[in-house]
Interface confidence: low
């Protein structure tokens, strides 16, 4: 017997077919134990990690991962060539840039080599699973006496593929002011008070032109501008993670 289970996921583009099969029709006593879900993220379009929770297995099992693309010259699965391990048990696979094709459906199969009938297949849209590097080289310049411009750089990914979240606050502010900047790695603040000290930081995501990734990068290193006078209450101005 076999059954198909549709798994819901935080990423609505991910659909997984869990194919559960018993060894023989006369042995219907216990269904095959489901396999853990595979989660993949493409890091800055440099490499991809597909990982699973190996500790969810009742006994230590070196699960194997095979993958292919839905539309490709060769429709056979290829096995992971670079496994990631947790406590000496396979818990993921790292796939290099040459094997990443963002705009083809990525088909990934997790299998228990001891029980080949125990396998799970998932289909992923990789363009929605890109996590960029944190923006770098933040620089501030004066456009005029009271107007500041912040610029930054993103490595390896075209700027127009990224959306940026800029946060800034002065030493008098209790919270960040934030705004979305699309595609252009710059932001100008029309009015600054030279008696205040400002802090800026930026993060990015691969959205919405080239993909629909909801995952933000890490925050950039903060940059500061303005008065170096001692803040009245420094504890208010520590950067949150």
């Amino acid at each position: 017997w076999s059954s198909k289970v549709l798994m819901s996921s935080a990423n609505e583009d991910i659909k997984a077919d869990l194919i559960l099969t018993s060894t023989a029709p006369e042995h219907l006593s216990a269904p095959t134990l489901p396999l853990p879900e595979v989660q993949c993220f493409v890091f800055n379009i440099e490499y991809m990690n597909c990982t699973w929770n190996s500790s969810s297995e009742p006994q230590a099992t070196n699960l194997t991962l095979h993958y292919r693309y839905k539309v490709s010259d060769n429709n056979t699965f290829q096995e992971c060539s670079h496994y990631l391990f947790s406590k000496e048990i396979t818990s993921g696979c790292q796939i290099q840039k040459e094997d990443i094709q963002l705009y083809q459906t990525f088909v990934v199969q997790l299998q228990d080599p001891q029980k080949p009938q125990r396998r799970a297949v998932q289909k992923l849209n990789l363009q929605n699973l890109v996590i960029p590097r944190a923006p770098e080289n933040l620089t501030l310049s004066n456009l005029s006496e009271s107007q500041l411009e912040l610029r930054w750089k993103s490595r390896h990914i075209k700027e127009r593929c990224l959306q940026y979240l800029v946060q800034y606050r002065s030493n008098r502010d209790r919270s960040w002011t934030e705004l979305i900047v699309n595609h252009e790695p710059r932001f100008s603040l029309p009015s600054v008070d030279e008696l205040k000290r400002y802090t800026f930081r930026v993060r990015s995501r691969y959205n919405p032109i080239c993909g629909s990734s909801q995952q933000w990068s890490k925050w950039s290193q903060p940059v500061h501008w303005g008065s170096h006078t001692v803040e009245e209450n420094p504890s208010l101005f520590a950067l949150e993670a």
Epitope: Q101, Y103, Q104, Q127, K158, I209, C210, G211
Partner: nanobody, 129 residues
Framework: QVQLQESGGGSVQAGGSLRLSCIGS????????MGWYRQAPGNECELVSS???????YYADSVKGRFTISRDNAKNTVLLQMNSLKPEDTAVYYC???????????????????????WGKGTQVTVSS
């Protein structure tokens, strides 16, 4: 101003050949993928062939073995040699430069198509039986 200019389109009998050429100006395209898309009336925009900055080529199944893509980074050009043309190859062919090799469909060729940064205006290819 960044521009992509296609040339080489025209009318040909089935089984004939055409060579499309695209030249980019206003920007060095050597880090971009460059490719050819096509759109027939009533159809979606589809990727015909693309070539990455390192020369790796991709071909749609429908053109494999018949079309050959090449590029010259120094001259910002990409060429598409089309042999054994079929009536179903009739379409407007667009040159594009962009971020990654592109897959999937979009309703119309142009800026909104996944990550391709620059587009030409298109050249008509008509293949009659």
């Amino acid at each position: 101003q960044v521009q992509l200019q296609e040339s080489g389109g025209g009318s040909v009998q089935a089984g004939g050949s055409l060579r499309l050429s695209c030249i980019g100006s206003g920007l060095p395209f050597d880090e971009d993928d460059m490719g050819w898309y096509r759109q027939a009336p009533g159809n979606e925009c589809e990727l015909v062939s693309s070539i990455s900055s390192d020369g790796t080529a991709y071909y749609a199944d429908s053109v494999k073995g018949r079309f050959t893509i090449s590029r010259d980074n120094a001259k910002n050009t990409v060429l598409l040699q089309m042999n054994s043309l079929k009536p179903e190859d009739t379409a407007v062919y667009y040159c594009a430069a962009g971020v990654h090799r592109q897959f999937g469909g979009s309703s119309s060729c142009g800026d909104a198509f996944y990550g391709m940064d620059y587009w030409g205006k298109g050249t008509q290819v008509t293949v009659s039986s």
